[in-house]
């Protein structure tokens, strides 16, 4: 058993049918010695008396808020949560496996630049009695500071019969140098509590590996005289690290017809312009990627050919 | 000033071209190592990230873009001293900091070159003959060093009398390649920045 926060404790259980569970001793936080009784949640049934209460915690019915009283007055509370270990592996019931970029990905994180700021998000089908707490650091043995905000509900989607809820959090490394070469990964730890179930999820990454630039901005077309060709131009996104001559991007320019079946013409360039043939009803899209370290491509910025 | 880089004139700034070749070569070599050594811990998540140049050179600090010198987090240690007779920017006035930066890059390349050559000698003794260093990568390191053209004491190739542990050698190869790739990215960024300056 360990303390998650004041008066909230996590009991770790080897979870299988007929498991013996864990013996837990609760102590009433009071100078009083006599006349103390214990109850669980809203029930008035007295579970025991005395300054300590010994319980065998086996299943969720044994978890909850234990309260010690004296003469009708509440003395203190202890909330017991359960953390299930199933055949050596901690349960992952609360969050959905996003399966991207690989199986068992519960937390996904992205950064728009090298400033040390990043966003993580996760999915769940649970709508109520759910709380998250996020901590982060650079490295784990001698951790350096990363400050995270509160996790917030950022999107709701309907997936088949189920509603899916997306939560996200923003974090900022306390003293980040955009040009630094990372040797210790960022660690992100999310504590999730649903009713009386506790779970924790972790992700470990280098900022360089989670970079995804914003799409190029100010995408414009300039027709070339007496030609079907157009000059496409764009600019670096505002959120990208500066100076741009140091943090350079490379670009992919795509001409896509109305129908998805039509052949796509693609051009790769390090410049912020390109000359392409504009077909009727086609659209031109441009996306960006770090020129020197191949992390994710940005989303497409698009303009119609007409 | 901060315009994206057009394809450079190699005569104007030959190092940019060489640094791009270097990044391509080390990335290819790392990919080959990951595939060939699939049963070894060779992915970024599995290896320890070690920097053989730590406390010996300070490329990131010495090559910091002027725009980032205002960022206190980037100014851990900027007092380094290297030889200042680089010829990469033969056609321009070379500031002290720029020479310091380029000589730091040269020292990095020299250190990695020695490590890779020593390692290749061990890998050539492996009866499995599973993986060797790409000669193209070694040649590209050499070309960039020549383009930087710094005079510096030659570091003797390390020789080891004991029987090599091939498993450890292959894991060390992965660690070295990951670290060298990261340094090659920094070198490419620096060359691009200097080319645009």
């Amino acid at each position: 058993i360990w303390e998650l926060k004041k008066d909230v404790y996590v009991v770790e259980l080897d979870w299988y049918p007929d498991a013996p569970g864990e013996m837990v001793v609760l102590t009433c936080d009071t100078p009083e010695e006599d006349g103390i009784t214990w109850t669980l949640d809203q029930s008035s049934e007295v579970l025991g008396s005395g300054k300590t209460l010994t319980i065998q915690v086996k299943e969720f019915g044994d978890a909850g808020q234990y309260t010690c009283h004296k003469g009708g007055e509440v003395l203190s509370h202890s909330l017991l949560l359960l953390h299930k270990k199933e055949d050596g592996i901690w349960s992952t019931d609360i969050l959905k496996d996003q399966k991207e970029p690989k199986n068992k990905t519960f937390l996904r994180c992205e950064a728009k630049n090298y400033s040390g700021r990043f966003t993580c998000w996760w999915l769940t089908t649970i709508s109520t009695d759910l709380t998250f707490s996020v901590k982060s650091s650079r490295g784990s043995s001698d951790p350096q500071g990363v400050t995270c905000g509160a996790a917030t509900l950022s999107a709701e989607r309907v997936r088949g019969d189920n509603k899916e809820y997306e939560y996200s959090v923003e974090c900022q490394e306390d003293s980040a140098c955009p040009a630094a070469e990372e040797s210790l990964p960022i660690e992100v730890m999310v504590d999730a509590v649903h009713k009386l179930k506790y779970e924790n999820y972790t992700s470990s990454f280098f900022i360089r590996d989670i970079i995804k630039p914003d799409p190029p901005k100010n995408l414009q077309l300039k027709p070339l005289k007496n030609s079907r060709q157009v000059e496409v131009s764009w600019e670096y996104p505002d959120t990208w690290s500066t100076p741009h001559s140091y943090f350079s991007l490379t670009f992919c320019v795509q001409v896509q017809g109305k129908s998805k079946r039509e052949k796509k013409d693609r051009v790769f360039t390090d410049k912020t312009s390109a000359t392409v043939i504009c077909r009727k009803n086609a659209s031109i899209s441009v996306r960006a990627q770090d020129r020197y370290y191949s992390s994710s491509w940005s989303e497409w910025a698009s303009v119609p050919c007409s | 000033r901060n315009l994206p880089v057009a394809t450079p004139d190699p005569g104007m700034f030959p190092c940019l071209h060489h640094s791009q070749n270097l990044l391509r070569a080390v990335s290819n070599m790392l990919q080959k190592a990951r595939q060939t050594l699939e049963f070894y811990p060779c992915t970024s998540e599995e290896i320890d990230h070690e920097d053989i140049t730590k406390d010996k050179t300070s490329t990131v600090e010495a090559c910091l873009p002027l725009e980032l010198t205002k960022n206190e987090s980037c100014l851990n240690s900027r007092e380094t001293s290297f030889i200042t007779n680089g010829s990469c920017l033969a056609s321009r006035k070379t500031s002290f900091m720029m020479a310091l930066c380029l000589s730091s890059i040269y020292e990095d390349l020299k250190m990695y070159q020695v490590e890779f050559k020593t390692m290749n000698a061990k890998l050539l003794m492996d009866p499995k003959r599973q993986i060797f260093l790409d000669q193209n990568m070694l040649a590209v390191i050499d070309e960039l060093m020549q383009a930087l053209n710094f005079n510096s004491e030659t570091v003797p190739q390390k020789s080891s009398l004991e029987e090599p542990d091939f498993y450890k050698t292959k894991i060390k190869l992965c660690i070295l390649l990951h670290a060298f790739r990261i340094r090659a990215v920094t070198i490419d960024r620096v060359m691009s920045y200097l080319n645009a300056s």
């Epitope: 080897d14 979870w15 299988y16 049918p17 007929d18 498991a19 299943e59 969720f60 270990k85 199933e86 055949d87 050596g88 592996i89 019931d93 690989k102 199986n103 068992k104 089908t125 | 049963f39 811990p41 599995e46």
Partner: antibody, heavy 115, light 112 residues
Framework: QVQLVESGGGVVQPGRSLRLSCAAS????????MHWVRQAPGKCLEWVAF????????YYADSVKGRFTISRDNSKNTLYLQMNSLRAEDTAVYYC????????WGQGTMVTVSS | QSVLTQPPSVSGAPGQRVTISCSGS????????VKWYQQLPGTAPKLLIY???QRPSGVPDRFSGSKSGTSASLAITGLQAEDEADYYC????????????FGCGTKVTVLG
Amino acid sequence: QVQLVESGGGVVQPGRSLRLSCAASGFTFSSYGMHWVRQAPGKCLEWVAFIRYDGSNKYYADSVKGRFTISRDNSKNTLYLQMNSLRAEDTAVYYCKTHGSHDNWGQGTMVTVSS
Amino acid sequence: QSVLTQPPSVSGAPGQRVTISCSGSRSNIGSNTVKWYQQLPGTAPKLLIYYNDQRPSGVPDRFSGSKSGTSASLAITGLQAEDEADYYCQSYDRYTHPALLFGCGTKVTVLG
């Protein structure tokens, strides 16, 4: 004590369907994940499928994906395996099993797919 | 073709010590715990070892398990006639959990 009893096995022609059941007793069935595991005559044990305690997630072996469906009825303390488009290579003893470090197995039910 | 590799058979005289190996990779045994089962002909598998080296109550201390890196092993000391059975190792893969990975079994023969 924990008890698992499989039923529903038998002889069936290729391409046909069969539904296996596993009746659970002696524990809070609705709190635990459950597996189906099979063993062809004289062959190795092969995992078939898993279902979470609340039925929210289901996982299948590639060899049965799209043909077999695992389900549970927690009000009846019963686990099911719906097997469609059966093939000769599905011939095996099918066991249900609890998920956990100390697991419990049923006695098995024989499924024979033969024309 | 099982992901976990076991020898097809091992044998020993009564009273002897035999060991069965089970080899996997970094993503399965290297990252997860190992179980061992005993299966007598015509019966369901019986759990012998869980969490690499733990014995459930009722399993004789002649059976012991261990794990090192990407391999595990089961040792039977003081071999007895009733130990003649098939023995299976089981683990998970970190990317496909909760799918069970089994070895293809080792037939233990008690000589004499």
